[in-house]
Interface confidence: low
């Protein structure tokens, strides 16, 4: 239906508290550079323009659209030339041009500093103050680095921080109450922000089509009792919410959201038998509940898939009446009989059904021809599940830190160009893995290793995108996404790539090293070790485990040594040589 | 456990008054920010009200300034919300939030003003 005007409408809907934590998101994902005050004074401007339309819909500019009222917002911010360069170029153009140029200038990695998390008690004295403003600035910090992420999961994560702190803030012990909560809260976040990422990749590169045939797949398994109309149905409006959220129109994007949760929750019946406990829930916790639903049960008497799509004489002619329709069909089908696969792997397989029904239903004889094409899934199937069994065999030999510079290293080796910090950072996200999906039960770690590998390489590709500097990665992340972690798998050490000439300063430490969290010690030892893969990239694991292990050692010995700086001046250049001997 | 339980809805006519309390039990209630918030039938949640641990600093909607008073008991633990000049968009079910909640786990009390 029509609103008279779309801001008071979805004012209306979301409730100030939402409407205000959604436009907050919004600004900061699209200007990122700006502060949390300069923000949240255009929200409280935002938030009493909207007010206004609410009390009389017919007030001047409450009609215009909010790409209109939220873009004429930004282009009025002071210095935007100076702070954002080419962006303000956007604020030449009329919508829908000017949004678009907006989506194009957002930053997957802007240059802020990491996001730090004060001390307990500092955190909880401003939380107690202000908690509005608290978790504004919370808002605002997660939702300039993470420009896609979905804005109503982050209202989630937001009132799970708000919970732990109300829980934490009033304990004697707080540091220990809030760490590990919050640090879980943290995981589950950037793990949100990457899968989001990937779902907005889709839909930008490929189109509405590509996204909903992921969103039939996924609702395939989770929901296998629903009928065929129930899942599309489903996957329509799930496509719509996700499009709305990539292309910055959050207040939609949430409102939608919102009325999915509970349509699935008055149709329990014709979806499935396990939504009960979520729709028990306020709003948020509801929405996000719904989104990891666990799988319902599949019925017991269903067919085999060849029935209806290899057996039958129609296949070509239902194919021919309705492509689309019969491929969503067949991906359904095979889904829902597959919650052990990855949605990735579901994909590939309906991609090479409909390539297979469009060779073979040219043909003459074409069931003959098609007669064999679940045979022809096999080696698809087979790749993926070796993957996973060799990969988690690895991790629990070698640890979530082990593992980690094992990707490390066979990564550097494939992509050698590729900046030694996103090798980094991409190789302890990828070895996260292990720990996420490998203690699962067998018929769980295959979607989740491969749907978690597929939305990790997309950021890879996303941050090579900027600056391309390697071939095998470009060839990689230019094919589909579904085919990505398998070329990636694929990959094997580029043999056009001159090794870089070895500089002892870059495996010159100092006595600072000592005192860095644990993660941040990792680091430093993992980018000597994309360094040195850099240095030679043919050095065997033996070679550059006994540099790693007497690089360690080095480590171990100076920190415990009495005069730290001494012992690193003085050991350093002995290891330096002791490394080129090493791999020489 | 956390709880808080509202109390003291009701009917009452346009341009009179209520005062709604809500009681909280398993957390240090001085050391927290309070909140009052509404949601009218098939409407959003609309945020009505804050105030400090101490009670020293209060906040309202445009929509409910200078008809509303938040007010707190740290003694008791005891949340209030005086309404004054009630009006028939103010029904609602109003519900208590610890700390700027952006949603309530709590039942809530349901305020109808009407005529």
């Known amino acids: 239906e029509a609103h008279k005007s779309e801001i008071a409408h979805r004012y209306n809907d979301l409730g100030e508290q939402h409407f205000k934590g959604l436009v907050l998101i919004a600004f900061s994902q699209y200007l990122q550079k700006c502060s949390y005050d300069e923000h949240a004074k255009l929200v409280q401007e935002v938030t009493d323009f909207a007010k206004t339309c609410v009390a009389d819909e017919s007030a001047a500019n409450c009609d215009k659209s909010l790409h209109t009222l939220f873009g004429d917002k930004l282009c009025a911010i002071p210095n935007l030339r100076e702070n954002y360069g080419e962006l303000a170029d956007c604020c030449t153009k009329q919508e829908p041009e000017r949004n678009e140029c907006f989506l194009q200038h957002k930053d997957d990695n802007p240059s802020l500093p990491p996001f730090e998390r004060p001390e307990a008690e500092a955190m909880c004295t401003s939380f107690k103050e202000n908690p509005t403003t608290f978790m504004g600035h919370y808002l605002h910090e997660v939702a300039r680095r993470h420009p896609y992420f979905y804005a109503p999961e982050l209202l989630y994560y937001a009132e799970q921080y708000n919970e732990i702190l109300t829980q934490c803030c009033a304990e004697a012990d707080k540091e220990s109450c809030l760490t590990p909560k919050l640090d879980g809260v943290k995981e589950k976040a950037l793990v949100s922000s990457v899968r989001q990422r990937m779902k907005c990749s889709s839909m930008q590169k490929f189109g509405e089509r590509a996204f909903k045939a992921w969103a039939v797949a996924r609702l395939s398994q989770t929901f296998p009792n629903a009928d065929f109309a129930e899942i599309t149905k489903l996957a329509t409006d799930l496509t719509k919410v996700n499009k709305e959220c990539c292309h910055g129109d959050l207040l939609e994007c949430a409102d939608d959201r919102a009325e999915l949760a509970k349509y699935m929750c008055e149709n329990q019946a014709t979806i499935s038998s396990k939504l009960q406990t979520c729709c028990d829930k306020p709003l948020l916790k509801k929405a996000h509940c719904l989104s990891e639903v666990e799988h319902d049960t599949m019925p017991a008497d269903l067919p085999a898939i060849a029935a209806d799509f290899v057996e039958d004489q129609e296949v070509c002619k239902n194919y021919a009446e309705a492509k689309d329709v019969f491929l969503g069909t067949f991906l359904y089908e095979y889904s829902r009989r597959h919650p052990d696969y990855s949605v990735s792997l579901l994909l590939r397989l309906a991609k090479k059904y409909e390539a297979t029904l469009e060779k073979c239903c040219a043909e003459a004889n074409p069931p003959a021809c098609y007669g064999t094409v679940l045979a022809e899934f096999q080696p698809l199937v087979e790749e993926p599940k070796n993957l996973v069994k060799t990969n988690c065999d690895l991790y629990e030999k070698l640890g979530e830190y082990g593992f980690q510079n094992a990707i490390l290293v066979r990564y550097t080796q494939k992509a050698p160009q590729v900046s030694t910090p996103t090798l980094v950072e991409a190789a302890r996200n990828l070895g996260r893995v292990g720990t996420k999906c490998c203690t699962l039960p067998e018929d769980q770690r295959l979607p989740c290793v491969e749907d978690y590998l597929s939305a990790i390489l997309n950021r890879v590709c996303l941050l090579h995108e900027k600056t391309p500097v390697s071939e095998h990665v470009t060839k990689c992340c230019s094919g589909s996404l579904v085919e990505r972690r398998p070329c990636f798998s694929a990959l094997t050490v580029d043999e056009t790539y001159v090794p870089k000439e070895f500089k002892a300063e870059t495996f010159t430490f100092h006595s600072d090293i000592c005192t860095l969290p644990e993660k941040e010690k990792q680091i430093k030892k993992q980018t000597a070790l994309a360094e040195l893969v850099k240095h030679k990239p043919k050095a065997t694991a033996e070679q550059l485990k006994t540099v790693m292990d007497d690089f360690a050692q080095f480590l171990d010995t100076c920190c415990k040594a009495a005069d730290k700086d001494t012992c690193f001046s003085t050991e350093g250049p002995n290891l330096v040589t002791r490394c080129k001997d090493a791999l020489a | 456990k956390v709880q808080l339980l509202e109390s003291g809805g009701g009917l009452v006519q346009p341009g009179g008054s209520l005062r709604l309390s809500c009681a909280a039990s398993?957390?240090?209630?001085?050391?927290?920010?309070m909140s009052w918030v509404r949601q009218a039938p098939g409407k959003g949640l609309e945020w009505v009200s804050s105030?400090?641990?101490?009670?020293?600093?209060?906040l309202y909607a445009d929509s409910v300034r200078g008809r509303f008073t938040i007010s707190r008991d740290n003694s008791k633990n005891t949340l209030y919300l005086q309404m004054n000049s009630l009006r028939p968009e103010d029904t609602a079910v109003y519900y208590c939030t610890i700390g700027g909640s952006l949603s309530p786990s709590s039942q809530g009390t349901l305020v109808t003003v009407s005529s």
């Open positions: 398993g957390f240090t209630f001085s050391s927290f920010g």
């Open positions: 105030i400090s641990g101490s009670g020293s600093d209060t």
